[in-house]
């Protein structure tokens, strides 16, 4: 099957790194300079990506593998293959259409890309605000405001010992 | 022109070892790349190992592992050393040269006269 198969279709025995190439009677040619095919059988190979402009090149393509970018210092990456690059900002701020802003009170970004998100409600969960936000930094949740109250304790108490021949209460 | 020259082959067992050698000379600095291909009788001319001169390597499915490319740059010479031969390895082996590419073709295109392969216990 394997001879039948060769000799019905030639392409289809050509490897990565080479097309059929027709004006060869249909023998496997090597990818031209700058171009790629990742896999068998290809009839044309695919042109090498070029890292341009704030793209800089992470992996230079090879007759078997397309390049890959990766962004410039001061921006980073977006999308499926890093297809575009988008400007850093600092902590504390988020990108806009006008540029890089801080972020609003009650919100922060820890990060040097993405947007602000609002601090955590502690309460929401029964707890409070043990150290506050800020522009970089959530909120730190402590213990709720009951176990604070005076007299309480944060260690818990050992368990009263029990005297034999008694069930617990 | 290019011409290409060709040496190496023979005779064979089964699971040993040659090494073939393809001199250019002439217009080499008009080359992009160079390999050997191979055609037994009655089969299509197949390919075999390429390298391109910015070191890509390529082999065909049944040689990988089996078989290594190289080039020495000084002498204008690739070389193809092949481990664990097998009878299906038999064929005339064949040095080609490519370069030029333009309008979606290879402007040259160089062949050696060929040297044969036989493996055989």
């Known amino acids: 099957f394997e001879r039948t198969r060769s000799l019905q279709d030639p392409c289809s025995n050509c490897p990565a790194g080479t097309f059929c190439d027709n004006n060869r009677n249909q023998i496997c040619s090597p990818c031209p300079p700058n171009s790629f095919s990742s896999a068998g059988g290809q009839r044309t190979c695919d042109i090498c990506r070029q890292c341009k402009g704030v793209f800089r090149t992470r992996k230079e393509c090879s007759s078997t593998s397309n390049a890959e970018c990766d962004c410039t210092p001061g921006f980073h990456c977006l999308g499926a293959g890093c297809s575009m690059c988008e400007q850093d900002c600092k902590q504390g701020q988020e990108l806009t259409k006008k540029g890089c802003k801080d972020c609003c009170f009650g919100t922060f970004n820890d990060q040097k890309r993405g947007i602000c998100r609002p601090w955590t409600n502690c309460s929401l969960d029964g707890k409070s605000v043990l150290v506050n936000g800020t522009k970089e930094r959530d909120v730190v949740c402590g213990p709720s405001p009951a176990d604070l109250s005076p007299g309480a304790s944060s260690v818990t108490p050992p368990a009263p010992a029990r005297e034999p021949g008694h069930s617990p209460q | 022109a290019v011409q290409l020259v060709e040496s190496g082959g023979g005779l064979v067992q089964p699971g040993g070892s040659l090494r073939l050698s393809c001199a250019a000379s002439?217009?080499?600095?008009?080359?992009?790349?160079m390999g050997w291909y191979r055609q037994a009788p009655g089969k299509q001319r197949e390919v075999v190992a390429l390298?391109?001169?910015?070191?890509?390597?390529v082999y065909g499915d049944s040689v990988k592992g089996r078989f290594t490319i190289s080039r020495d740059n000084a002498k204008n010479t690739v070389y193809l050393q092949m481990n664990s031969l097998k009878p299906e390895d038999t064929a005339v082996y064949y040095c080609?040269?490519?370069?030029?590419?333009?309008?979606?073709?290879?402007?040259?295109?160089?062949w050696g006269q060929g040297t044969q392969v036989t493996v055989s216990s």
């Open positions: 080609n040269a490519l370069g030029g590419w333009e309008n979606g073709k290879y402007k040259y295109d160089y």
């Open positions: 390298i391109t001169s910015g070191g890509s390597t």
């Open positions: 002439g217009s080499i600095f008009s080359i992009y790349a």
